[in-house]
Interface confidence: low
């Protein structure tokens, strides 16, 4: 098992019935206030539309919110903190015909209705402050 | 720039002990994450460990678990292999890296040092 460089950016094609599967570490203690964040974009560039944003405050709560003509809309936010100090863990994000249903550590965590078409996400990015063992897309 | 150093390399036998350094010197030389890479003749190099630059996460290969073990002193500049149980097969010039990346992927390092020699006799 070979860790994998991040940022992560990966090509890729989604649908009904998607999953993309993220498995990694934070690398530091939570204390030190560790990210890990997860951008489906529209285009192979970083200032590009993003259909899902979801960020993780380590310890602390989780952002998600999505990205038109370079203008965040409205923020959701949950305090629940399914990720363990110094633990992996493995986030699933399964594409639903209305929503990306996440998962972490195989236990449902928040349901993120769909505001971009998901046919138009064309770039996974996976990055911040954690180290990186598996990313995979399932069609 | 950055410049990195590696000392601590030789003779050893099998089933002894070396701990390798490495000095990294430069502007922000102790924000880069920093691994170990060897290349034995003939073979491709080869991953051995890495450390994220604050040193709160390590990750090693698989095959040298439990015998080597990467560390570093920020105050120093300074990154350590400590390699213990040591094996004919662990012959190799080891190199250190740095870079903005934690990876075992030695194409996501910038920066290299010259390595040193290290050889195991049985």
């Known amino acids: 098992m070979s860790l994998l460089s991040v940022p992560h950016t990966e090509s890729v094609s989604l649908s009904t019935g998607s999953t993309v599967t993220i498995k990694g570490r934070p690398l530091v203690c939570f204390l030190n206030e560790p990210h890990l964040q997860v951008d489906f974009h529209t285009e192979m560039k970083e200032d590009s539309d993003i259909a899902f944003h979801f960020q993780v405050y380590f310890g602390n709560r989780v952002v998600m919110n999505s990205r038109e003509f370079k203008i965040w809309k409205e923020e959701v936010e949950s305090k629940n903190m399914p990720f363990q100090d110094g633990q992996e863990f493995e986030l699933s994000i399964l594409v639903l015909e209305d929503k990306y249903q996440v998962m972490v550590n195989g236990q449902a965590y928040y349901n993120f209705n769909h505001r971009i078409p998901v046919s138009s996400v064309k770039m996974v990015q996976v990055w911040r402050d954690i180290s990186l063992t598996k990313f995979n897309v399932s069609n | 720039q950055v410049q990195l150093v590696e000392s601590g390399g030789g003779l050893a036998q099998a089933g002894g002990s070396l701990r390798l350094s490495c000095v990294a010197s430069?502007?922000?030389?102790?924000?880069?994450?920093m691994a170990w890479f060897r290349q034995a003749p003939g073979k491709e190099r080869e991953f051995v460990a890495a450390i994220t630059w604050a040193g709160g996460y390590t990750y090693g290969a698989d095959s040298e678990k439990g015998r080597f073990t990467i560390s570093r002193d920020n105050a120093k500049n300074t990154v350590y292999l400590q390699m213990n149980s040591l094996k004919p097969e662990d012959t190799a010039v080891y190199s250190c890296a740095g870079g903005r990346l934690f990876t075992s992927q030695s194409s996501a390092y910038q920066y290299w040092g010259q390595g040193t020699q290290v050889t195991v006799s049985s």
């Open positions: 430069g502007r922000a030389a102790g924000t880069y994450s």
